[in-house]
């Protein structure tokens, strides 16, 4: 168990725990104090004791010992009074820290005393060698508990230079692979540096005498270190491994390292000392095996095999941990260790080995674990697990502390919980005690709640209530009890309405650049704070101040200017402080594809066959499958910025071999196309030029025709540059008179035409045009027939006659002309005709001529749209490419037809039952007018009751109709007649009904001179005539508001002029009908006294 922080008021004791101790190995130098450290925590206060070499050691009773008087410390210091006092205290120390709950133990502390280092006295004899031989200068420093550093120097304190030939070994000896006369020195001194004592001692100088020789003999390598052929080493896991090979020989050997058993771990291996030393950092199991050094020179080699075994000091797999336990629990302390060789594990309880304890103890040791069942407070103890092998020792202290604590509920009493219907509520009841208290939940009646399967308890005391219902609202009680006491708290639960999304956003597919609107509606518990937010692919969306990308309002999310990056899942999140619901919709943004990202040309050798392979990376399809790829090219030389399609390939294809034209500078691009259209094109490819070739095509549309009577102009459609197949193209033009079988005349030209001069008029020629370039000629061209220049036709068409079809159409016929007289290609006939005048009277106004062009194979034409009852002049001419020949002429007349419609039919109301009709004759008589036909019928009787009668006077312009109904509207139709019958009708609708009602002056206005005023109005069509009064009334004080007598005026007269007005005076004009005031207006006369007449044409009364 673990005592929670909130569990207050119980002062629990603590078993001892070692907090600080001296290192496992302590080397003491002559001048140093000895400090042994051991500190521990615990309640009650901890007592310390020490052992040395397994025997009780009392620091306080030793001379020169200072013990630290501190409640948590058992450390002490020994101060010496002579240089070898430390020898007396050498040994293995251990500290034990105890209180009433148990004993903790420190690891073994090995104290070693190191004396002042001294080189044993020795007589160093001179070393004599012959030049080229090898030699070893020994160092043999005194032994040391701490690592030391060796240096070789001369008497001037200068380091001996080391290289491939001269090397110091790990053992301190100086090795010469072969000596040179320059090595001859009497002062080779070995210095040993002891960092612990901060002292350097030096060996007696060695005198190396080198005898010169005339013939140095080459010899193959031999190992000076190690001397035998193989050796076995143990390397410790995690530690560095150092292997060394030093060889002699002449010339100086070089060293190589090999690992036959596997690869050399390059990241952890370094070679030092001119390759003589191999250092492997952080040895691991995989480094086990054979390592070989090879010393080589030109005469041979020597080798040494190191067999390395990797072992390891003990290390933890699972270290035992201290724990608190309640009565009755099972305590288990795991002690799992590893090492090589496998370590031996021993257990102690309170520092005493378990073997020495009474046999009736309740613990058992099982697979590296110490187990105690049904623990009681009396089982409280500190255990030690110790593991050792030949490389080291591992120790762990761990306590078993059995406590008895009363039950306590750590959750506050009278807490209110709120949750929504259908959700799960969690009522907390965190209880603690030892033994662990039991927890029970009861309802307001004191009954256990667990009878309802919706209620479920957790091990930590929490009560869960799933599928909450409104009637779960209420008070609940939690009861915690153990063998010492029991306690209760109360919890209030309030169940609220769940938030619901009633209409969520819908998945949609939208086009790039458009906008999308998502809507969301939700219902909330009225007592909770509602919120609707939006998320896009899990990110909260907000309206950004500097951008109008998102618009969020009233459960609406609008995303503007859609781009492909906007695609994803959008969700509406409806939430309160108690619950969150989310409704998700997917947005797919579609549009034309992305650009083809990469374009590569390959198989460029095919350019010689006018082919190349184009490959590309697929474009982004933007959610609409790519239907095709369009491959285009541009020729920067001939048509920069102009792209031509070479073809399209299916959308699942990403390469194609293209058929090209010779000598075109091709730059390619590829565009993906889907149903939304083409995307951006790819980056352009490199430019490739196809080799030149002879033309594969000849010009088309070859023609030969003269532009003069004595020449023939040969023209053709020039080849497009992409068909030139070379930098330039020319044209080989050949011609000869048709049917002669004679030799061809020819000329090579660059322009797309050739003029052949001195030809006879209209002679047929055979013509050929062939493309030619630097590589050769195009294919054999086809023969085309051309003609030399034409002359004006001499043929006159002979008229066969004119047939009158009706009053406005005639059929004209003529005989075909003699083609020999055409002097060229008969292109057709020009027919020209014009009206000379009416048969009624001949006008001398401007004559308008009409033309009809008739094809060469036709010898008749219908002339329509003629005016009836008219005289016409007609001409027919044959024409060719040069122009028209002489005309044949003819005159004809059209018969009478029916007239056009009468002009301007007006209805004038005379009374409730009578109307006056007024009209003008038709513009086109089309014959001799014989009179008019008038028809009329009431409108609402659907054409029944039609009345029709002839007015036989062609000069008639008015007609009075009586006996009309004042309540009906009529349709009036008037037609003019000739002997051919009535013509087009003019139609008007009206009657006396609407028109005889309230008077309407329409657009009425007044203008003034100096002594008169004109009032004018527009009478309404068909308005019955009536009479009314006009009254002019002068305004102003000096005029005294004088009125002129009222004047009687007729509506049909359209205007009225009032004379005898005062100059520069304002007048009001009043209009009355049957004593009823109808209209009022104002006018002002001009300011001079001269009389002016009104404009002509105004009626006065």
């Amino acid at each position: 168990i673990q005592i929670p922080e909130e569990y207050e008021g119980h002062h629990v004791m603590e078993p001892p725990v070692i907090t600080e101790q001296s290192p496992r190995r302590l080397v003491v130098f002559p001048t140093d104090d000895i400090s042994l450290k051991c500190e521990a925590s615990g309640k009650p206060e901890v007592q310390f004791r020490w052992t040395r070499d397994g025997v009780h050691f009392k620091p306080k009773e030793e001379l020169g010992v200072t013990v630290y008087q501190s409640p948590h410390s058992g450390s002490f210091t020994i101060t010496g009074n002579n240089s070898n006092f430390a020898q007396r205290f050498q040994g293995i120390y251990r500290c034990f820290a105890s209180n009433k709950l148990g004993t903790a133990m420190s690891h073994e502390i090995r104290l070693m005393a190191e004396g002042a280092p001294k080189w044993p006295k020795e007589t160093v004899k001179p070393v004599e060698v012959e030049e080229g031989e090898s030699v070893v200068l020994p160092c043999n420093p005194p032994p040391s508990a701490e690592p030391l550093r060796i240096y070789w120097m001369n008497s001037k304190i200068l380091h001996i230079k080391q290289d491939e030939r001269v090397t110091m070994g790990q053992n301190g000896n100086l090795y010469f692979a072969n000596v040179l006369t320059s090595d001859n020195h009497s002062d080779y001194i070995c210095h040993a540096h002891f960092p612990g004592t901060r002292t350097i001692i030096q060996k007696e100088p060695i005198d190396l005498r080198v005898k010169a020789t005339n013939s140095m003999i080459d010899r193959k390598p031999r190992l000076l270190f190690p001397t035998n052929s193989s050796s076995h080493l143990v390397a410790l896991q995690g530690q560095p491994l150092v292997l060394e090979c030093i060889a002699e020989g002449f010339p100086t050997p070089t060293i190589k390292w090999l690992r036959p058993s596997g690869p050399m771990p390059a990241d952890r291996v370094t070679y030092q000392n001119h390759n003589k030393t191999l250092q492997l950092l952080k040895v691991g199991e995989e480094d086990d095996g054979e390592y070989r050094c090879l010393a080589e020179n030109s005469l041979g080699s020597a080798r040494h095999a190191y067999y390395v075994t990797v072992e390891a000091a003990p290390y933890w797999l699972h270290k035992p941990q201290s724990h608190l336990y309640g009565p009755g629990e099972t305590a288990r302390l795991d002690c799992q260790v590893q090492g090589r060789p496998q370590p031996e594990v021993t257990w102690r309880i309170n520092g005493i080995p378990v073997e020495e304890l009474a046999k009736d103890q309740k613990y058992r040791i099982q697979r590296g674990a110490l187990i105690l069942s049904n623990v009681q407070p009396s089982d409280t103890m500190v255990t030690q697990c110790e593991a050792r092998n030949r490389h080291g020792l591992l120790l762990a202290n761990a306590y078993i502390y059995v406590v008895q604590l009363p039950a306590k509920i750590l959750t506050a009493d009278n807490q209110t919980y709120m949750a929504v219907q259908g959700s799960t509520a969690y009522l907390l009841c965190k209880a603690f005690g030892a033994p662990v208290p039991s927890v029970q939940w009861l309802d307001e009646d004191g009954t256990t709640v667990l009878q309802d399967e919706r209620f479920f308890p957790y091990a930590n005391g929490t009560l869960g209530i799933r599928d909450l219902q409104a009637n779960d609202t209420g008070r609940y009680f939690c009861l915690a009890a153990n063998d010492q006491n029991n306690v209760t708290i109360m919890a209030n639960l309030k169940v609220k309405d769940a938030t619901q999304i009633t209409q969520g956003p819908r998945s949609t597919i939208e086009k790039k650049g458009s906008r999308v609107t998502f809507t969301c509606q939700a219902s909330f518990d009225p007592s909770l704070q509602p919120s609707i937010t939006w998320r896009g692919d899990g990110r909260d969306l907000q309206e950004l101040g500097d951008s109008d990308k998102y618009f969020i309002e009233d459960g609406r999310l609008v995303i503007h200017s859609l781009d492909y990056s906007d695609q994803g899942n959008y969700s509406c999140v409806a939430s309160t402080e108690l619950d969150v619901v989310e409704s998700r919709a997917q947005l797919l943004v579609v549009g034309s594809p992305g650009p083809v990202p990469r374009l590569v040309l390959s198989d460029l050798h095919l350019l010689t066959q006018s082919q190349v392979r184009v490959s590309w990376s697929p474009a982004e399809d933007h959610n609409a499958p790519i239907e095709k790829y369009d491959i285009e090219f541009e020729d920067k030389e001939m048509a920069p910025e102009k792209w031509y399609s070479l073809g399209k390939v299916p959308g699942n294809q990403t390469s194609t071999t293209l058929k090209l034209s010779p000598y075109v500078h091709y730059t390619f691009r590829v565009t993906a196309i889907n149903k939304y259209g083409p995307g951006e094109p790819s980056p352009v490819s490199e430019t490739v030029v196809t080799p030149e070739a002879a033309p594969e095509k000849n010009p088309v549309d070859v023609k030969g025709e003269g532009n003069e009577t004595t020449n023939m102009v040969i023209t053709w459609k020039p080849l497009r540059w992409m068909d030139w197949n070379a930098p330039q193209v020319q044209y080989r033009v050949q011609w000869r008179p048709q049917g002669t079988r004679g030799p061809w005349q020819e000329q090579i030209v660059s322009d797309p035409f050739l003029v052949v001069s001195n030809t006879s008029t209209f002679v047929p020629y055979e013509i050929k045009v062939q493309a030619v370039n630097s590589q050769g000629k195009g294919p054999e061209p086809q023969v085309t027939i051309g003609y030399s220049g034409e002359d004006y036709p001499q043929a006159i068409p002979e008229l066969e006659g004119i047939e009158i079809l009706n009053s406005s159409a005639v059929l004209v016929k003529w005989r075909p002309v003699d083609l020999a007289q055409v002097k060229g290609h008969l292109r057709g006939y020009n027919v020209t005709y014009w009206r000379e005048g009416s048969q009624r009277k001949h006008s001398k106004r401007h004559i308008h001529k009409d033309h009809v062009v008739v094809p060469a194979n036709t010898t008749s034409v219908i002339l329509s749209g003629l005016r009836p009852y008219s005289s016409y002049h007609l001409e027919v001419q044959a024409f060719n490419g040069r122009g028209s020949g002489p005309a044949s002429e003819f005159t004809f007349s059209t018969p009478e037809g029916v007239p056009g419609h009468p002009e301007a039919l007006h209805l004038e109301c005379q009374s409730n039952t009578s109307l006056l009709l007024r009209w003008q004759p038709p513009l086109s008589h089309n014959g001799v007018l014989t009179g008019y036909v008038l028809s009329y019928h009431p409108l609402d009787e659907g054409g029944k009751g039609q009345l029709s009668f002839n007015l036989r006077d062609p000069e008639l312009r008015t007609h009075n109709l009586t006996d009309l109904s004042p309540h009906l509207r009529y349709r009036f139709q008037l037609q003019a007649t000739t002997k051919e019958g009535p013509g087009e009708a003019i139609v008007r609708e009206g009657g006396t009904m609407a028109l005889s009602g309230i008077s309407d002056f329409g657009n009425i206005s007044a203008t003034a001179g100096e002594n008169y005023s004109v009032v004018s109005w527009v009478p309404k069509e068909g308005q019955c005539n009536f009479r009314f009064h006009i009254l002019f009334k002068a305004l102003g004080e000096e005029k005294g508001g004088a009125s002129l007598s009222p004047q009687y005026v007729s509506y049909n007269q359209s205007s009225y002029t009032q004379w005898d007005l005062q100059p520069d005076t304002d007048y009001e004009i009043h209009l009355f009908k049957e004593r009823m005031f109808r209209h009022q207006m104002a006018v002002k006369t001009n300011g001079t006294g001269r009389v002016r007449l009104p404009p002509a044409g105004f009626a006065t009364e």
Epitope: L601, H605, T608, K636, E686, T687, V689
Partner: antibody
Framework: QVQLVQSGAEVKKPGSSVKVSCKAS????????IQWVRQAPGQGLEWIGY????????DYAQKFQGRVTLTADESTSTAYMELSSLRSEDTAVYYC????????????WGQGTTVTVSS | DIQMTQSPSSLSASVGDRVTITCRAS??????VAWYQQKPGKVPKLLIY???TLHSGVPSRFSGSGSGTDFTLTISSLQPEDVATYFC?????????FGGGTKVEIK
């Protein structure tokens, strides 16, 4: 006349980067692609990649992918080649060359830039 | 990648001699092969393309032949100024690759 002038020799440490420049004159810079080739001491020629100075589109030999960056500055008619994570085997003379109009050949060459990579 | 193997790696000939250098491609490259000349301390110079087309300004004593995988550069009459290293290059496919070079010296 057409000229390609490269930047001076460089000595670099392994792991560092080098940027070589190539200034073009005597022709319209954007009309011709620039290719880069290198020649290790006493060795043959090795193609590195190309750049289109008008669109800045570039492509590289697989061997150099991820280590080489080709760029161009139209305003100064200069192409650049940057090689990163240098190793001793990158010691070479680096050439820029103008691609012939119409075929992937090299019609004009820069004078070469010696890059030495050594610790 | 297409390998271009050139032989010999070096040759020595007298002034006026006919010199032949060969180049073999690891796969069919049609006639998409070029030859370059690199004089000591100078930059390479284009001599021939499409296996046999002489680049403008190149003396006519230089000629090329071959198609598919085997190609030849011939100097009909060796001149002192022809001392150089000659490289072949394929441009049928990317990456563009060069031969190892043939060093031509005068005896």
């Amino acid at each position: 006349q057409v000229q390609l002038v490269q930047s001076g020799a460089e000595v670099k440490k392994p792991g560092s980067s080098v940027k070589v420049s190539c200034k073009a004159s005597g022709y319209t810079f954007t009309n011709y692609w620039i290719q880069w080739v290198r020649q290790a001491p006493g060795q043959g020629l090795e193609w590195i990649g190309y750049i289109n100075p008008s669109t800045y589109y570039s492509d590289y030999a697989q061997k150099f992918q991820g280590r080489v960056t080709l760029t161009a500055d139209e305003s100064t008619s200069t192409a650049y080649m940057e090689l990163s994570s240098l190793r001793s085997e990158d010691t070479a003379v680096y050439y820029c060359a103008r691609r012939q109009f119409g075929l992937p050949l090299f019609d004009y060459w820069g004078q070469g830039t010696t890059v030495t990579v050594s610790s | 990648d297409i390998q271009m193997t050139q032989s010999p790696s070096s040759l020595s000939a007298s002034v006026g001699d006919r010199v032949t250098i060969t180049c073999r491609a690891s796969q069919d490259v049609g006639t998409a092969v070029a030859w370059y000349q690199q004089k000591p301390g100078k930059v390479p110079k284009l001599l021939i393309y499409w296996a046999s087309t002489l680049h403008s300004g190149v003396p006519s004593r230089f000629s090329g032949s071959g198609s598919g995988t085997d190609f030849t550069l011939t100097i009909s009459s060796l001149q002192p100024e022809d001392v150089a290293t000659y490289f072949c290059q394929q441009y049928s496919n990317y990456p563009l690759t060069f031969g190892g070079g043939t060093k031509v010296e005068i005896k």
